[in-house]
Amino acid sequence: LRPPRVHNSEENTMRALTLKDILNGTFSYKTFFPNWISGQEYLHQSADNNIVLYNIETGQSYTILSNRTMKSVNASNYGLSPDRQFVYLESDYSKLWRYSYTATYYIYDLSNGEFVRGNELPRPIQYLCWSPVGSKLAYVYQNNIYLKQRPGDPPFQITFNGRENKIFNGIPDWVYEEEMLATKYALWWSPNGKFLAYAEFNDTDIPVIAYSYYGDEQYPRTINIPYPKAGAKNPFVRIFIIDTTYPAYVGPQEVPVPAMIASSDYYFSWLTWVTDERVCLQWLKRVQNVSVLSICDFREDWQTWDCPKTQEHIEESRTGWAGGFFVSTPVFSYDAISYYKIFSDKDGYKHIHYIKDTVENAIQITSGKWEAINIFRVTQDSLFYSSNEFEDYPGRRNIYRISIGSYPPSKKCVTCHLRKERCQYYTASFSDYAKYYALVCYGPGIPISTLHDGRTDQEIKILEENKELENALKNIQLPKEEIKKLEVDEITLWYKMILPPQFDRSKKYPLLIQVYGGPCSQSVRSVFAVNWISYLASKEGMVIALVDGRGTAFQGDKLLYAVYRKLGVYEVEDQITAVRKFIEMGFIDEKRIAIWGWSYGGYVSSLALASGTGLFKCGIAVAPVSSWEYYASVYTERFMGLPTKDDNLEHYKNSTVMARAEYFRNVDYLLIHGTADDNVHFQNSAQIAKALVNAQVDFQAMWYSDQNHGLSGLSTNHLYTHMTHFLKQCFSLSD
């Protein structure tokens, strides 16, 4: 649902996008994800900040928590207890890393309309959650886990050894948060709340990254983070489970690690409860090509957890690392022992498999030269998943239903023909037992969220259709977008090209390549966006291209694992190859080609600029990695192995940006980094700058004081303004 193309007579009423539009978020869209609380009910925060409960079947809705109550404690978030007796209100949000934050929590008693007084929660809390049944509370405070049987009860302390930057209970340390769990929590309630499982991370021996935070004081303070870089000592993880009904007698019981995992350095990758007395843990060797899924059972007589070898399932990759970005997690069926899981089939495509006894005897559920992306829900008779099968576009996502109750199983695409032009990239959110579900369409047209019947797939209502956005865009000259592919030497390179509104193939345009290119990433997606590059095309007349080269995801293992142990080679080659193909198309001014990227994209853009091809006039690297020895162990070693002589040290050394300092002499290079980047440390850019200075190569640079990897707030405006000036100067465009 892009605004229709206008005839020339109307063009004078249309305007191009401005940088201000982008920085103000004028054309941002909304999505609607129901906060499901049963099969047919969900909560949603209304525009005026009331928390409203909707019942789909009765069509009724009522406010369970008023905006007045929310405002009384400055709440920015809430959580209803499953017994619907209490709500926690979250305020004083204080961001830590990507997912983690601390907050103050208040418990509101819905039955008497008052806040719970007595035995109030300490502050600030690092994580808090209700049990899945009733109103038990588990929370993490000062790296220790506490339990409350009821909100007004005194807390029971589960762990005692928590220590800042040393021992983390129930929350991940930096590297597990960012690179393994992708959550702020590391504790998991069993389905009925009988048991609580949690991880303990011991960071005692991990080297610490230290950087200055300048603040406003006379002396800067030093931020210290235990951060294992490639090859360094890693966190030591243990998993414990405690009986929450009678927590004191037996205390936390450690879950044993499979012998084949425990024999060398390892990671814990995820925990999935199957029943109250069965749990599934996933482990990964430090060399991340072997993963073990271990199903453990509660032994009541001993009050311990037993993980028999017969319930260990090994997943191994011989061509790369285990899994995609992460090892996939299992979705258990109703028999509580068999499960569905996505992993590579014999042809090297990630597909859904059904595992009943052994992985070797797995039954393949989906197949083809496309990939299953995510399993949303398994019910008694259906399995819902997303894939990029439809019409062979890897950058699309559609939702499918497979009937598993009947044989042979039948497959239906739920979304493929709903709003075919507008919606080609979906995700979904299911209520209990998949009685209802919400579909959230991200594009390529204006995003829309809809509610559907889980049995018939009928659309019940539109939850959010972004009407205001649609109206706002009516007089905007948006760029044209096309997604196509290049076939080069048996490699398919999908690209997205963003073209100026009055694009004319007979003219020549400056080209900007936007690159990310990290392993298992995907940039070429059929999604809606009005962002900086939209502005560059709309107002400044640039052509922007995004190319998914080797190492990117959802097109099979051959493309994905091509970069294994060789980061910084093929990703760069494929961007260069694509640029050459774009030049051949005839509308690119080959004297005005630039490349830019952020994070991994900053690394690739830097290497592309220093490739010596003479293709690029200029480029920008924002917060780039410059040497894989500087980045996190979990991420780096997954793709590169270890930086040791007997492993892959040689390529670690060969793939640095610094090694190519000399090659920057003939390009204009803008290097940008936040000084408080906890993720890709400022060290990376500091080393690039040092190498360029030592090589007497001129370059431009911008640092953002006290900013992290996201360069948020006012820094964002400054950043995009600065990069715009740089590109316009490079392309000789007038200001």
Epitope: F156, Y249, E254, Q303
Partner: antibody, heavy 122, light 107 residues
């Protein structure tokens, strides 16, 4: 001062049921800080834990004895009891009742009864 | 079950001697180890909890240390009333298990 006192027959025939009661005085059995346990010691040998009970009735047993043991509690009488059925000569021991502190962890037996010798013999 | 092994099983010592008894668990029990003293015909008496915490009223010549699998009970200067059998006990898991005992006798 807390006191625990075991009572019950000193002689039980093989295959019959051993029954003992522990009476707690000087403190309430209905505390969330304690479990109440039974431990035995065969003549000249070491100590063996039989099981423990919470005032609410929650029990934990030694798996080696679980099929034969029942521990119960009577909060109104401030007592808890042990029943061990199908006894053999191997069950001959001094039987102790004890209080097990559980909060803060770890559990430990801080108060013991003086013990009662139960002989299994026909 | 977690096996608790004490060594030595018996020792002879004189008043004033420093005595050390060790207790080894078959698997890690963190610090969840307790020590008891038992005299003939008497119930065990509780001495130390959590590997190293002295029960109030217990003389300071008794001390405990260790964590994981290896633990020690030390009597810094043996007194006449200390001649008895000493038991370690783990409370990390079920079943609660005791060591076989170490008998401290007069030399």
């Amino acid at each position: 001062q807390l006191q625990l006192q075991e009572s019950g027959p000193g002689l039980v025939k093989p295959s019959e049921t051993l029954s003992l009661t522990c009476t707690v005085s000087g403190g309430s059995i209905s505390s969330s800080t304690y479990y109440w346990g039974w431990i035995r010691q065969p003549p000249g040998k070491g100590l063996e834990w039989i099981g423990s009970i919470f005032y609410s009735g929650n029990t934990y047993y030694n798996p080696s004895l679980k099929s034969r043991v029942t521990i119960s509690v009577d909060t109104s009488k401030n007592q808890f009891s042990l029943r061990l059925n199908s006894v053999t000569a191997a069950d001959t021991a001094v039987y102790y009742c004890a209080r097990e502190i559980i909060e803060p962890r770890p559990g430990y037996f801080d108060y013991w009864g003086q013990g009662t010798l139960v002989t299994v013999s026909s | 079950d977690i096996q608790m092994t004490q060594s030595p099983s018996s020792l002879s010592a004189s008043v004033g001697d420093r005595v050390t008894i060790t207790c080894r668990a078959s698997q890690s029990i963190s610090k969840y180890l307790n020590w008891y003293q038992q005299k003939p015909g008497k119930a065990p008496k509780f001495l130390i909890y959590a590997a190293s915490s002295l029960q109030s009223g217990v003389p300071s010549r008794f001390s405990g240390s260790g964590s994981g699998t290896d633990f020690t009970l030390t009597i810094s200067s043996l007194q006449p009333e200390d001649f008895a059998t000493y038991y370690c006990q783990q409370s990390n898991s079920i079943p609660r298990t005791f060591g076989q005992g170490t008998k401290v006798e007069i030399k």
